[in-house]
Interface confidence: medium
C-alpha cells in the first residue's frame, strides 16, 4: 500500500531537499526559508532567490519552511504552575518548564501541570522525584499511602483500601495485649 | 481556615444534566486555578476539570470534553461545573479543590457531592 500523501508533502517530494515546488508553476523548485524566517514571496524563477522575512517578535519558526506565517510563540501556562525556562526567539519556541521540587504531571501530549514533589513524611523515598514523576513514597508502619502522602492509620475507614494495609498493625496490638494477659 | 462546600449532586438518568457548585471561603478565591476532581466507587481520584483564576483558561480530561463547563464567579466566591449527557461512568463524588502546586486541601477536603447516573 502506498501511504497517501497531502498535496504539500506531494509537491514537496518533487524537488530536492531544501527546495520546493512553487505553487503556480511545478517546474519550478523554490528554495526554502531557513529558521527564523518566513515566506513572503515564491522565487520568481528557477535559480532565483526566495524573498523570506524574518519573524517579527512573538513569533517563530523553528526549521526550514515555506511557511506563508511564522508561528505564535506558546505562552507558559501560569494557572498550571509553569514557568518560563527560555524565552521565545525567532528560531525557537518558548520553553516551559516547573520549579524545582516539582514534576510535570501530563493530562494530554501537549499539556502538562507541575506539582510539588512528594516529602514522604511519616515515610522514606523510595524513588526520587523525577521530571516526570512524583517521588514514590514507603510508608512507615502505623501509615498508609493516600494520593502519595503517608495518612495515618487512624484516618482509615472499613470502606477504604487501607484496612487490608492498616489492619494487621491494629491485630498485632491486640495480639500483644492478649499475651500480656495470658 | 479553608472550606470548600459542594452542593448540587443528585440521581440522574443517563442522558441527563446537573449542576454541581462549590462555596469557597478562608481564601482569596480569586487568586487560585480551581478545579474538579472526583472518586468513583473503588476508585482513586481522578481529576476531571479545572479553571484558571480570571477563568479565561479551561481544562476538561478527556472523557468529559464537550458535556461538562467549568465556571466560576469570583464575586461570590463560587466554582460551577455544568454536567450535560450524563453517563454512567460519571457515577462519583465530585470535590471541589484549589491548585497551589498540589491539589489542596486534598486528604482533608469536604464531604463531595455524590452524582449517581442510573436508570
Known amino acids: 500500500l502506498v501511504p497517501h500523501l497531502g498535496d504539500r508533502e506531494k509537491r514537496d517530494s518533487v524537488c530536492p531537499q531544501g527546495k520546493y515546488i512553487h505553487p503556480q508553476n511545478n517546474s519550478i523548485c523554490c528554495t526554502k526559508c531557513h529558521k527564523g524566517t518566513y515566506l513572503y514571496n515564491d522565487c520568481p524563477g528557477p535559480g532565483q532567490d526566495t524573498d523570506c522575512r524574518e519573524c517579527e517578535s512573538g513569533s517563530f519558526t523553528a526549521s526550514e519552511n515555506h511557511l506563508r506565517h511564522c508561528l505564535s510563540c506558546s505562552k507558559c501556562r501560569k494557572e498550571m504552575g509553569q514557568v518560563e525556562i527560555s524565552s521565545c526567539t525567532v528560531d525557537r519556541d518558548t520553553v516551559c518548564g516547573c520549579r524545582k521540587n516539582q514534576y510535570r504531571h501530563y493530562w494530554s501530549e501537549n499539556l502538562f501541570q507541575c506539582f510539588n514533589c512528594s516529602l514522604c513524611l511519616n515515610g522514606t523515598v523510595h524513588l526520587s522525584c523525577q521530571e516526570k514523576q512524583n517521588t514514590v513514597c514507603t510508608c512507615h508502619a502505623g501509615f498508609f499511602l493516600r494520593e502519595n502522602e503517608c495518612v495515618s492509620c487512624s484516618n482509615c475507614k472499613k470502606s477504604l483500601e487501607c484496612t487490608k494495609l492498616c489492619l494487621p498493625q491494629i491485630e498485632n496490638v491486640k495480639g500483644t495485649e492478649d499475651s500480656g494477659t495470658t | 481556615e479553608v472550606q470548600l462546600l459542594e452542593s448540587g449532586g443528585g440521581l440522574v438518568q443517563p442522558g441527563g444534566s446537573l449542576r454541581l457548585s462549590c462555596a469557597a471561603s478562608?481564601?482569596?478565591?480569586?487568586?487560585?486555578?480551581m478545579g474538579w476532581v472526583r472518586q468513583a466507587p473503588g476508585k482513586g481520584l481522578e481529576w476531571v476539570s479545572q479553571?484558571?483564576?480570571?477563568?479565561?483558561?479551561?481544562y476538561y480530561t478527556h472523557s468529559v470534553k464537550g458535556r461538562f463547563t467549568i465556571s466560576r464567579d469570583n464575586s461570590k466566591n463560587t466554582l460551577y461545573l455544568q454536567m450535560n449527557s450524563l453517563r454512567a461512568e460519571d457515577t462519583a463524588v465530585y470535590y471541589c479543590?484549589?491548585?497551589?502546586?498540589?491539589?489542596?486541601?486534598?486528604?482533608?477536603w469536604g464531604q463531595g457531592t455524590l452524582v449517581t447516573v442510573s436508570s
Open positions: 479553571i484558571s483564576d480570571t477563568a479565561d483558561r479551561t
Open positions: 478562608g481564601f482569596t478565591f480569586l487568586k487560585y486555578s
Open positions: 479543590a484549589i491548585y497551589t502546586g498540589r491539589w489542596v486541601p486534598f486528604e482533608y
